[in-house]
């Protein structure tokens, strides 16, 4: 139960006080008691409940006509059952007794009022009155947790605008309102109550730039909503009529959790006594609601795909046809960014990561725009953000970034349990250097901080700086599986490729050619690849780098060897000893449910079939997956990327609600 104020009573004159329903009000009967009195009794109107405790140990008793010793150990508290119809209509009489004096009476006239700030603290999608039931001032995680949730209103419901909805002080329409969380102020007071009292709604100065509150006028159009709290306004005096009244507020978050903002916002209503014009207003009562800003959540490959994105560039029509066919099979919408909009930047995966935000009443896809800002720079803002599609970005928008700030270097695992700790939304994975040096690359700290601050997908730092491009999607992927943990981790494996090629040579296929059928590309015999000492040394180094990540992933995702599939792949070390795929990198695949779009490796053809394709199919088809090999050689591979790098996917949000987890 909420804490009310302390009321001091005195026999000299009647005391007038306000008691808010649902609060516990302390009654000080001692400090002004007549000197010779040693005991007291209390009588109250039927609407007032008086509790007297004499402790320690406390003996609690509701009032009757019994007398109590007048000493500091006696605690008297009041609660009110009903709101007053008129000012001071509830009475409490205290009678003081002494051995030699007649009883002395002190009168207290109480006005019971109902004032409660309600939000969806039970996370049901509906606002229910919570008076005297739960403490709204705390926010707790887990299935038994409580606390309201706010969405960053980061979509653009107004197609005429170039800004996010949270960047203006207006409510566009009911669509815009649905992105906000409802908070209701319920009051029930005597008619004349607000001639001497005022209600003020306020937010801490440290939080005022993170939230905006609109007041709705009931029965009017939503456009009648007016801003009452926000970056310029930490407090607002409310014009409340007496009697029974409900006032609706719509609350939007303006910022995602980050290093300097844990994501909690407290909105408070204060009841002020303004009866004495000579004196400052006095606080009578406060009620608060704590909201947590919904985190941005990534979706792993195991979530069903809903929309595929790719770029149209010079001569990639065949690639797009393959992706289109795959999207149709997976029943996905397909969005192609035309040449005139991508400015010859085909790396859709690197430009953005599509996740979502969720409150009990609303789920919203949100695109996280990377700071790489090349030709696709405008695509997330102009073509992805829109009605019910949010936008967020972090990091420097001009320079100061590295290749590791592209989002091919940002992935998320499926849900895992690690040494008893559950990660029901998976864990974020991104690449880094293994130690800082003058020329090592790392994901920009602003991006790392943002990802960590979301709390629900605790990030894991992998080692990817050994790669020329430096992205985790160059050596790992996840695919759905019907058994075990519901997925497999795929890792690029030089060892597995050498093993396969050695087996083929042993069977007399040493003359079979890698890159057969690719014009203008020097072909390589299996026997030459196997005998090339430098290439072996390079791949031995690569294997060590991938093995480092393998052990890290096993430890941080709680995986066993049987959860991992090795995909045959060779690399070569290029300038500054950075690795690139020697043939199209098959692990860099597009995963659309059970349909996989895998870079066509152009491996040695043996008995009419590419032995690399055959090997991969034999590894993945038993899991119910269908492998489509896509020719990306000249349009993507030789430009240092593959199918995954050139595509992006919006996926279905988790059915698991983020607030039910315990980070």
């Amino acid at each position: 139960m909420a804490q009310g104020t302390l009321i001091r009573v005195t026999p000299e004159q009647p005391t007038h006080a306000v008691c808010v329903l649902g609060t516990l009000t302390q009654l000080d009967i001692c400090s002004s008691a007549p000197e010779d009195c040693t005991s007291f009794s209390i009588n109250a109107s039927p609407g007032v409940v008086v509790d007297i405790a004499h402790g320690p140990p406390a003996k609690k008793k509701s009032t009757g006509s019994s007398t109590w010793p007048l000493d500091p150990g006696v605690e008297v508290t009041l609660t009110m059952k009903v709101a007053s119809g008129s000012t001071g209509d509830q009475k409490v009489q205290i009678s003081y007794y002494g051995p030699k004096t007649p009883p002395v009476k002190a009168l207290l006239y109480l006005t019971g009022v109902e004032i409660s700030l309600c939000a969806d603290i039970t996370r049901t999608g509906k606002v229910k009155p919570t008076r005297a039931v739960k403490d709204q001032r705390t926010w707790t995680w887990g299935p038994c947790g409580q606390g309201a949730i706010l969405l960053v209103n980061c979509d653009r419901d107004n197609l005429e605008s170039s800004a996010m909805d949270c960047e203006d002080d207006e409510v566009l329409d009911s669509e815009d309102l649905q992105d906000m969380s409802l908070m209701t102020l319920s009051t029930k007071t005597p008619k004349d109550f607000f001639t001497n009292h005022t209600l003020v709604l306020h937010v801490a100065r440290s939080e005022m730039d993170k939230v905006r509150v609109f007041q709705a006028t009931r029965g009017k159009l939503s456009s009648k909503c007016s801003v009452v709290l926000g970056p310029k306004w930490p407090s607002h005096y409310l014009m409340v009529p007496g009697g029974k009244h409900n006032m609706d507020f719509y609350v939007e978050a303006l910022a995602f959790p980050d290093t300097d903002f844990p994501g909690l916002i407290t909105l408070t209503i204060s009841l002020l006594d303004t009866s004495n014009l000579e004196l400052p207003e006095a606080v009578v009562f406060q009620d608060s609601v704590v909201f947590r800003v919904a985190p941005w959540i990534m979706t792993p490959n195991t979530q069903p795909p809903q929309e595929v994105y790719a770029c149209s560039i010079f001569e990639n029509e065949d690639f797009l046809k393959s992706v289109t066919t795959l999207a149709m099979k997976a029943k996905c919408k397909l969005t192609i960014c035309p040449e005139e909009e991508n400015m010859d930047d085909q790396w859709m995966q690197d430009e953005m990561e599509i996740g979502y935000i969720q409150a009990p009443h609303k789920t919203l896809p949100v695109v996280f725009d990377s700071p790489r800002n090349r030709g696709l720079k405008e695509f997330p803002i102009k073509r992805v953000m829109g009605p019910d599609f949010g936008y967020v970005t972090r990091g420097p928008q001009t320079g100061g970034i590295s290749g590791l700030d592209s989002f091919g270097n940002l992935e998320v695992s499926p849900p895992v349990t690690v040494r008893g700790k559950e990660y029901p939304l998976g864990r974020i994975l991104f690449g880094d250097s293994c130690y800082p040096s003058n020329d090592s690359r790392q994901m920009h700290q602003a991006l790392q901080d943002f990802l960590s601050a979301q709390q629900v997908q605790a990030p894991v730092k992998l080692y990817s700086d050994w790669l020329s491009v430096g992205h985790v999607d160059e050596f790992l992927s996840f695919v759905p599986a019907p058994d075990r943990k519901g997925f497999r981790l795929l890792l690029a494996s030089p060892r597995s490729c050498y093993k396969l090629f050695q087996e083929q040579q042993n069977e007399g296929h040493g003359e079979a050619l890698l890159f057969e059928g690719i014009k203008k590309k020097k072909q390589q015999k299996i026997k030459n690849i196997l005998s090339n000492k430098t290439l072996r040394e390079h791949n031995s180094f690569v294997e060590r780098c991938i093995d480092w990540n393998r052990e890290l992933l096993k430890r941080e995702l709680g995986l066993a060897e049987s959860d991992i599939i090795d995909i045959p792949q060779l690399f070569k070390l290029k300038e500054f000893s950075k690795a690139e795929a020697f043939f199209p990198n098959m692990v860099n695949m597009l995963v659309l449910g059970k349909h996989l779009g895998i870079p066509k490796p152009f491996g040695p053809v043996i008995n009419g079939r590419c032995c690399l394709e055959e090997k991969v199919c034999s590894l993945l088809e038993p899991l119910g997956l269908q492998c489509t090999f896509i020719n990306d050689f000249f349009t993507y591979h030789i430009r240092h990327g593959e199918v995954h790098c050139g595509t992006n996917v919006r996926r279905k949000p988790f059915s698991f609600k983020w607030w039910n987890m315990v980070p």
């Epitope: 020329d439 020329s468 020097k522 070569k572 300038e575 500054f576 030789i638 990327g641």
Partner: antibody, heavy 128, light 111 residues
């Protein structure tokens, strides 16, 4: 064969900034590793910076690290050298140079470590 | 002071052979096969004449040859010609924090 033309040099006070550009013609610069090399008046060559074709990693000489930034815009067929906090000892002719990234080599050819195409250079003078 | 050491000058008569040395350490010339040589005529940009220790770009006469032994690389020009008079610079990849090093340059005079 690609041809390179540097621009953006000039006289600048110590502590000032300049942005050098290296524009390519005759071929697509995105197929080339690019380095900047400088030569102080009457002195030898000094390697300054490097950027790879994928535009994903860069390297710098100790003498310029933290002050100079190399970048490329493949759409504009250009590479840039942003030079901040310039010092008198940065006075030199700045050459843009490149090497083709040959995808056919079975193993690394070391093409990022040598420069087979050079521009004519642009003079940067840092003086008060 | 340059990281790779070259003689300040060498000379030779037309038709003769000259060798220019380039001495580094086990962290550059001795470690990598990424040694290259450049020719620079006065007022002109340098020109690549040898890469990967001994390979010649197309158009470079076979009078120019490169080799390496231990921490020292060498450029040999046989059958000297007047137009060979120029400054010559060696370069190597290095494992130091500056990944490409140049020698101080050698002035070749054709007598």
């Amino acid at each position: 064969q690609v041809q390179l033309v540097e621009s953006g040099g000039g006289l600048v006070k110590p502590g000032g900034s300049l942005r050098l550009s290296c524009a390519a013609s005759g071929s697509t610069l995105s197929d080339y590793f690019v380095s900047w090399i400088r030569q102080a008046p009457g002195k030898g060559l000094e390697w300054v910076s490097f950027i790879n074709t994928a535009n994903t990693f860069t390297y710098y000489a100790d003498s310029v690290r933290g002050r100079f930034t190399i970048s490329r815009d493949n759409a504009k067929n250009s590479v840039y050298l942003q030079m901040n906090s310039l010092r008198a000892e940065d006075t030199a002719v700045y050459y843009c140079s490149s090497a083709n990234d040959d995808v056919d080599d079975i193993v690394a050819p070391g093409r990022g470590y040598y420069m087979d195409v050079w521009g004519r250079g642009t003079l940067v003078t840092v003086s008060s | 002071q340059s990281a790779l050491t070259q003689p300040r000058s060498v000379s030779g008569s037309p038709g003769q052979s000259v060798t220019i040395s380039c001495t580094g350490t086990s962290g550059d010339v001795g470690r990598y096969s990424h040694v290259s040589w450049y020719q620079q005529h006065p007022g002109k940009a340098p020109k690549l004449i040898i890469y990967n220790v001994y390979e010649r770009p197309s158009g470079v006469p076979d009078r120019f040859s490169g080799s390496k032994s231990g921490n020292t690389a060498s450029l040999t020009i046989s059958g000297l010609q007047a137009e060979d008079e120029a400054d010559y610079y060696c370069s190597s990849h290095s494992r130091s924090s500056t990944p490409v090093l140049f020698g101080g340059g050698t002035k070749l005079t054709v007598l």
